[in-house]
Interface confidence: low
């Protein structure tokens, strides 16, 4: 990343796994460089942390008593460090939800996984990949959003009632595409425009529901940067 260049933004859904990508591409003269590579991930939490921050599971202790006791810019700390021999270190006990995909490393992928991502994980991340004679870096900003699906009117419906389902994710830009589906057995059946289903951006309008419409409905929001989120809602229609 060039000095002054914009830091790439990665979006993730609160409560879902998040991948913080880091796949530097370099000409390797010797495979041992990659096999013995070490990586260190650091996190600079967003300033003015959200309510969840005092209990930040990744932050170095001791935890402050109240958000106000954090400075305007929480200090950077090491989330995870994996040495050349595969030895790991970080804030102890090492959080099992913070992982490097070991199998991905055969593809030169040093991405950090948060399983799941939490609100307090938002902020700037830096990875340093240490090779024998050089170091490569990745830098990104993690933003977290909340996904929800609401029904209007809410609650149980009766046959012949109408309902509007609204699929949303707390991100400022609009999704590039919205796909609606129903779960049927092991598969997903796409919901298409029809007299029974009217699709408009992130809204699905069912003008006349029946007991057959009971069960899970889902939407997938896909954004221009490739981020997508799947949201489910269980509709109840009484006979």
């Amino acid at each position: 990343l060039q000095p002054g260049a914009e830091v790439p933004v990665v979006w993730a859904q609160e409560g879902a796994p998040a991948q913080l990508p880091c796949s530097p591409t370099i000409p390797l003269q010797d495979l041992s460089l990659l096999r013995r590579a070490g990586v260190t991930w650091q996190h600079q939490p967003d300033s003015g942390p959200p309510a969840a921050a005092p209990g930040h599971p990744l932050a170095p202790g001791p935890h402050p008593a109240a958000p106000s006791s954090w400075g305007p810019r929480p200090r950077r700390y090491t989330v995870l460090s994996v040495g050349p021999g595969g030895l790991r270190s970080g804030r102890l006990p090492l959080q099992p939800r913070v992982q490097l995909d070991e199998r991905g490393r055969q593809r030169g992928d040093f991405s950090l996984w948060l399983r799941p991502a939490r609100r307090a994980d938002a902020g700037e991340y830096r990875a340093a990949v240490h090779l024998r004679d050089r170091a490569l870096s990745c830098r990104l900003r993690l933003r977290l959003g909340q996904a929800s699906m609401t029904a209007s009117p809410p609650g149980s419906l009766r046959a012949s009632d109408w309902v509007i389902l609204n699929c949303s994710f707390s991100r400022p830009d609009r999704p590039a595409s919205v796909h609606w589906f129903r779960n049927r057995g092991q598969g997903r059946v796409p919901v298409r425009e029809s007299p029974h289903h009217h699709l408009a951006e992130s809204f699905l309008f069912l003008p006349q529901v029946s007991p057959m419409d009971s069960g899970p409905w889902g939407c997938i929001l896909t954004y221009r940067d490739g981020f997508n989120v799947s949201i489910m809602y269980n509709l109840t229609v009484l006979g």
Epitope: S23, I26, P27, L28, L31, L34, Q106, R107
Partner: antibody, heavy 121, light 107 residues
């Protein structure tokens, strides 16, 4: 030393199937992906795709989607290429190629000796 | 896909000659170009990768240069064992693509 040994030449009739094997030795099989590359008679090379030996996940080049299947038997460190519904234009030498020393990039340093597949009626 | 155009397609030279082969990429591939040597009935051997890095064990008479779209492969002083077909390949992204080859023959 690191090497890939492929199965012998095959003569097949159009419409038949063939399975080419590629046995790896000298390194940990699941630590390097396996590529397949085709060289038609008197022609250059075409990259057919890759199979990640840790997950078994294949990726095929566009023109090799459909009749071509990559598979693995990690217990014997062997990768396989199966071609079904053979056509005369499938006649070529097929190479398995490990990017053993080049995992971050798409260049190839360990090649099998090649398997000639001839399709003729 | 990125196209690699190699020239010349064939070349006659004598032992001791300096030989140069060129390769042009259809788009910028930075320095991600490899060169291979193939002898009849054999598998290719990697000589050069990342435009100018010699692979392990490759003699110093083989060299490569270039960046962006234009690349050059040079044999500084031909030896009898160098008569073969040479291929360039871009390793900038998938799918990796090869040039059509340059057959180097004895004059």
């Amino acid at each position: 030393q690191v090497q890939l040994v492929q199965s012998g030449p095959e003569l097949k009739k159009p419409g038949a199937s063939v399975k080419v094997s590629c046995k790896a030795s000298g390194y940990t099989f699941t630590e390097s992906p396996m590529n397949w590359v085709r060289q038609a008679p008197g022609q250059g090379f075409e990259w057919m795709g890759i199979i990640y030996t840790d997950t078994g996940e294949p990726t095929y080049a566009e023109e090799f989607k459909g009749r071509f299947v990559f598979s693995l038997d990690t217990s014997v460190s062997t990768a396989y290429l199966q071609i079904s519904s053979l056509k005369a234009e499938d006649t070529a030498v097929y190479f398995c190629v490990s990017d053993y020393g080049s995992i971050l990039y798409w260049y190839f340093d360990v090649w099998g000796q090649g398997t000639l597949v001839t399709v003729s009626s | 896909d990125i196209q690699m155009t190699q020239s010349p397609s064939s070349l006659s030279a004598s032992v001791g000659d300096r030989v140069t082969i060129t390769c042009k990429a259809s788009q910028d591939v930075s320095t991600a170009v490899a060169w291979y040597q193939q002898k009849p009935g054999k598998s290719p051997k990697l000589l050069i990768y990342s435009a100018s890095y010699r692979y392990t064990g490759v003699p110093s008479r083989f060299s490569g240069s270039g960046s962006g779209t234009d690349f050059t492969f040079t044999i500084s002083s031909l030896q009898p064992e160098d008569f073969a077909t040479y291929y360039c390949q871009q390793h900038y992204n998938a799918p990796p693509t090869f040039g059509q080859g340059t057959k180097l023959e004895i004059k």
